[in-house]
């Protein structure tokens, strides 16, 4: 926890932020919250970010303050107004962009005193895998695909049976890059799998981790996946 | 078409002040954010100051603090760049840079050259 | 500071060849540099931004890639006006900073 501390005289008040990580080209949130203030008109919303010369976003007697904004934010903020009262100063990042990761500070004034605090943003790609047999191949195969991840990942395939088991001599890993020129497409393929066994396929970087599994019996394919954002931390 | 004409610069004895200007035209001056770059004589590029769209934010290396003051005034499309106590190594030549939709480095002046000197 | 080392300082090329130019950063600006290009006694040029976009107006021979620390701009078939100084620029972090160049000359 960070408290943001009174400058001349005035109280300090207490600020929270989450560490966080955007979905590039994807809506972002950027938390925040404090002590709230019972007057709308008494508090003040500031976004700053390391490097911009201006303001990400300001919000000020109830209303957005736009006039000190930087260009590469213009159009893609807003903070949830309604919820300002009850002491949330989150900022919503509209198309999130890799260039948008780094140090923001959320800097709040109201009638108590003054807060802020830093909040460490990510940015990349990453998107669920989907697991399937694939039915072309000579052998038994199963075919791993996920559509957008950013820095490159690593992909490990895992089973349930043989648990431990280092499969990457018998799997083969892809990346092709995106028509964005930035994120990739990871394809992986496992060979040589076994009738009644669960296999995964985990894919990660250092903004988040998923994983596909996929039971496979004589007379069924049951597939799961989820993903996990990884380095959520409180500030 | 975006144009910066930079002015200004001249022969300043070390300790002197001397004032910068950058008239800006063919673009909305007051939405974007403004630089000043310098190149030394050996051609290094050192960012001097940075202001924000309104003015109210302004930004220096800790090492040029205090002694140079950048401000504008979109009412006339102008940058400025006041600049005291000035030495030798102040010597180089003065660019201003415009930001674009894309960075803060898209659009650049020709360039107003300082020289200190005794 | 953010230190922006830029390699190599000179380079001899031919007309038609490929060229590659790299600014390493000491810690990592999430793809926020830009590559100017300075002709001789003129001002700069933007050619990318953000590490991999092309400025309007730049030809496609140019080129940007990298990510985290490591940046390099790339010029395919190299024609005779784009033989001139090129700088990479961060503005990830205050104070933004420049690499020391690449003079590009004609071998």
């Known amino acids: 926890l960070i408290i943001g501390f009174g400058i001349s005289g005035r109280h300090s008040i207490t600020v929270t932020t989450v560490a966080s990580a955007g979905n590039i080209g994807e809506d972002g949130i950027l938390s925040c919250t404090f002590e709230p203030d019972i007057k709308l008109s008494d508090i003040v919303i500031q976004w700053l970010k390391e490097g911009v010369l201006g303001l990400v976003h300001e919000f000020k007697e109830g209303k957005d303050e736009l006039s000190e904004q930087d260009e590469m934010f213009r159009g893609r903020t807003a903070v949830f107004a309604d919820q300002v009262i009850v002491g949330n100063a989150s900022l919503r990042l509209k198309n999130v962009q890799l260039t948008d990761a780094g140090t923001y500070k959320c800097y709040i004034i109201t009638s108590k005193g003054k807060g802020n605090a830093n909040l460490e943003y990510k940015t990349g790609a990453f998107s669920m895998p989907e697991v399937n047999v694939d039915y072309n191949a000579s052998s038994e195969t199963l075919r791993c695909e996920a559509p957008r991840w950013f820095p490159q990942p690593t992909v490990v395939w895992a089973s349930q049976v043989d648990q431990g088991a280092n499969f990457s001599e018998v799997s083969n890993t892809s990346f092709e890059l995106n028509s964005e020129n930035v994120t990739m497409k990871v394809v992986s393929v496992l060979y040589n799998v076994t009738i009644n066994n669960t296999y995964s396929c985990m894919i990660e970087n250092d903004i988040a981790k998923a994983t596909g599994d996929i039971k496979v019996t004589e007379s069924e394919i049951k597939r799961r996946s989820h993903l996990q954002l990884l380095n959520s931390k409180a500030s | 078409e975006v144009q910066l004409v930079e002015s200004g610069g001249g022969l300043v004895k070390p300790g002197g002040s001397l004032k910068l200007s950058c008239a800006a035209s063919?673009?909305?001056?007051?939405?974007?954010?403004m630089s000043w770059v310098r190149q030394t004589p050996e051609k290094r590029l050192e960012w001097v100051a940075g202001?924000?769209?309104?003015?109210?934010?302004?930004y220096y290396p800790d090492t040029l603090k205090g002694r140079f003051t950048v401000s504008r005034d979109n009412a006339r499309n102008t940058l400025y760049l006041q600049m005291s106590s000035l030495r030798s190594e102040d010597t180089a030549k003065y660019f201003c840079a415009s930001q674009g939709s894309n960075h803060y480095f898209d659009y650049w002046g020709q360039g107003t050259t300082l020289t200190v000197s005794s | 500071d953010t230190l922006m080392t830029q390699s190599p300082s000179s380079m001899s090329v031919s007309l038609g060849d490929t060229v590659s130019i790299t600014c390493h950063a000491s810690q990592g600006i999430h793809n926020n540099i830009g590559w100017l290009q300075q002709k001789p006694g003129k001002s700069f040029k933007a050619l990318i931004y953000?590490?991999?976009n092309l400025e309007d107006g730049v030809p496609s021979r140019f080129s940007g890639s990298g990510s985290g620390a490591d940046y390099s701009l790339i010029i395919s078939s190299l024609e005779s006006e784009d033989f001139a100084d090129y700088y990479c620029v961060q503005y990830a972090q205050f104070p933004y900073t420049f690499g020391g160049g690449t003079k590009l000359e004609i071998k």
């Open positions: 202001i924000s769209s309104g003015g109210s934010y302004t």
């Open positions: 063919g673009f909305t001056f007051s939405r974007y954010a």
């Open positions: 953000h590490g991999t």
